[in-house]
C-alpha cells in the first residue's frame, strides 16, 4: 500500500468560450481508495477555489459553467490525489479559455454540381458556421477544411478553405458518387468533428479539369 501516483490534467475543451471542461488521468492508486480534487486560481489572484462541478464532464473531470468561466484570464489548476497513505499533486496547468475551443461541426452542408455553359463544370460546396459560435464579435476566426472521396475509395482528398464558407472543386471523376464533409477550427483551438457526410452523384458527362 502506497500513496497515490501523480495525476495529470491532459485535456481541456470549450465548445464556445462560455463554459469549459478539463479532464485528468489518475496516477497509480497505491492499492487504496483514492480521492481526487481539482483546485484552481485565476491569474493575478491568490485565492484558491475548488472545482465547481465534478459531474457534468464524466469521471475524472471538472466542468466550469458560465458563472465560473472568464475569457482573457489564465486559470492555474492542479489535481490533488489523496489516499490513506498520503497525497500527490499534478503539475500546474495554465489554461486560457480562448485557446481551448473545440466547436461543433459546421451546419447546413450543401453540395451541388454546377455546369456553366461557358466554363468547366465544378462541384460547389457551401456550409454555415456552428450556431454556438459568435463570429460577429470578432473574437472568433473560424478556419474550414473539406474532405471528399468517391464512395468506395479508401483515401480522402483534403482541401483547406481558410475562412470561406463555400468552395469550388474542379477535378472529379465522372460517374462516381462522392462523400463530402466539412470541419472547422478556431485560429488557435481544436478541429471540430467532421460534419455528417453529404452524398453527391457526379454526372457521367462531367469533364475532368486538366
Amino acid at each position: 500500500q502506497l500513496p497515490p501516483g501523480k495525476p495529470e490534467i491532459f485535456k481541456c475543451r470549450s465548445p464556445n468560450k462560455e463554459t469549459f471542461t478539463c479532464w485528468w488521468r489518475p496516477g497509480t492508486d497505491g492499492g487504496l481508495p483514492t480521492n481526487y480534487s481539482l483546485t484552481y486560481h485565476r491569474e493575478g489572484e491568490t485565492l484558491m477555489h475548488e472545482c465547481p462541478d465534478y459531474i457534468t464532464g464524466g469521471p475524472n473531470s471538472c466542468h466550469f459553467g458560465k458563472q465560473y468561466t472568464s475569457m482573457w484570464r489564465t486559470y492555474i489548476m492542479m489535481v490533488n490525489a489523496t489516499n490513506q497513505m498520503g497525497s500527490s499533486f499534478s503539475d500546474e496547468l495554465y489554461v486560457d479559455v480562448t485557446y481551448i475551443v473545440q466547436p461543433d461541426p459546421p451546419l447546413e452542408l450543401a453540395v451541388e454540381v454546377k455546369q456553366p455553359e461557358d466554363r468547366k463544370p465544378y462541384l460547389w460546396i457551401k456550409w454555415s458556421p456552428p450556431t454556438l459560435i459568435d463570429l460577429k464579435t470578432g473574437w472568433f476566426t473560424l478556419l474550414y477544411e473539406i474532405r471528399l472521396k468517391p464512395e468506395k475509395a479508401a483515401e480522402w482528398e483534403i482541401h483547406f478553405a481558410g475562412q470561406q464558407t463555400e468552395f469550388k472543386i474542379l477535378s472529379l471523376h465522372p460517374g462516381q458518387k462522392y462523400l463530402v464533409q466539412v470541419r472547422c477550427k478556431p485560429d488557435h483551438g481544436y478541429w471540430s468533428a467532421w460534419s455528417p457526410a453529404t452524398f453527391i452523384q457526379i454526372p457521367s458527362d462531367f469533364t475532368m479539369n486538366d
Epitope: E8, R25, T74, L93, V95, D96, W191
Partner: antibody, heavy 120, light 107 residues
Framework: QVQLVQSGAEVKKPGSSVKVSCKAS????????MHWVRQAPGQGLEWMGE????????NYNQKFKDRVTITADKSTSTAYMELSSLRSEDTAVYYC?????????????WGQGTLVTVSS | DIQMTQSPSSVSASVGDRVTITCKAS??????VAWYQQKPGKAPKLLIY???NRYTGVPSRFSGSGSGTDFTLTISSLQPEDFATYYC?????????FGGGTKVEIK
C-alpha cells in the same frame, strides 16, 4: 518530470537539409503546442514555427515558410524540424520549446539545443 | 512583424543592486509579453508571462510590469545566480518575436 531531449549536433553543407528531433517525456505529448526557436552564435532568439501535436496543425514564421517543415509523431512523442536549402547564416543552436499551457505562446520547457553548423 | 527593442543592451551591477530592463514593442501588444533568463550554453528559462505574472518557482525578486507597448523587468536585489542575459518576447501577433537581449554583468 517534463523533459525535451534533442538530437545531436550536425555539420551540413550549404544547399543541403537538416532534420532535428525533439523527444518529449513526462507529460502527454498531444496536450501542448511545440515550438522551434533558433539562436545564431552570440545573437538573440528567433521563433521559427509551432505545431499542435494533437492534429499536426502548424504555423510558421513567414521568413522560413518555404524552407522549414515542422512535424510531430504521436506514437513516439517526438517533434521534428526540417530546414532545407541551408546557408551559412543558418548556423545556429536550434531549440524546441513547449508551450507553457493551454493558451498563448510563452515557453515553459526547452530542449537542450542542437547546434547546426553550415559550412562548405 | 512586431519589433521588441530592449534597453540597455548590457548593464553592470553588483550583488544586492536593483536592476531594471525595459522592452518597447513597435505595436500595441496588450499584456502578451514574457521574459526569459539565459545563461551561457544553456536554454532560456521562463520568468514572467502575461507581462506581470511570475511563473511557478521563480523567485519573488523578479517582477514584470507594463502594458500596451512599454514593459519592464525588475530584479529587486540582484543575486550571484542572476548574472545572465534576459530576453522579452511578444505573443500578441505572428510571428512571435523576441527582444535583442540585455546582458547583466558583474560590476
Amino acid at each position: 518530470q517534463v523533459q525535451l531531449v534533442q538530437s545531436g549536433a550536425e555539420v551540413k553543407k550549404p544547399g543541403s537539409s537538416v532534420k532535428v528531433s525533439c523527444k518529449a517525456s513526462g507529460y502527454t505529448f498531444t496536450t501542448y503546442w511545440m515550438h522551434w526557436v533558433r539562436q545564431a552564435p552570440g545573437q538573440g532568439l528567433e521563433w521559427m514555427g509551432e505545431i499542435d501535436p494533437s492534429d499536426s496543425y502548424s504555423n510558421y514564421n513567414q521568413k522560413f515558410k518555404d524552407r522549414v517543415t515542422i512535424t510531430a509523431d504521436k506514437s513516439t512523442s517526438t517533434a521534428y524540424m526540417e530546414l532545407s536549402s541551408l546557408r551559412s547564416e543558418d548556423t545556429a543552436v536550434y531549440y524546441c520549446a513547449r508551450n507553457g499551457g493551454l493558451g498563448p505562446a510563452w515557453f515553459s520547457y526547452w530542449g537542450q539545443g542542437t547546434l547546426v553548423t553550415v559550412s562548405s | 512583424d512586431i519589433q521588441m527593442t530592449q534597453s540597455p543592451s548590457s548593464v553592470s551591477a553588483s550583488v544586492g543592486d536593483r536592476v531594471t530592463i525595459t522592452c518597447k514593442a513597435s505595436q500595441y501588444v496588450g499584456t502578451a509579453v514574457a521574459w526569459y533568463q539565459q545563461k551561457p550554453g544553456k536554454a532560456p528559462k521562463l520568468l514572467i508571462y502575461s507581462a506581470s505574472n511570475r511563473y511557478t518557482g521563480v523567485p519573488s525578486r523578479f517582477s514584470g510590469s507594463g502594458s500596451g507597448t512599454d514593459f519592464t523587468l525588475t530584479i529587486s536585489s540582484l543575486q550571484p545566480e542572476d548574472f545572465a542575459t534576459y530576453y522579452c518576447q511578444q505573443y500578441s501577433s505572428y510571428p512571435w518575436t523576441f527582444g535583442g537581449g540585455t546582458k547583466v554583468e558583474i560590476k
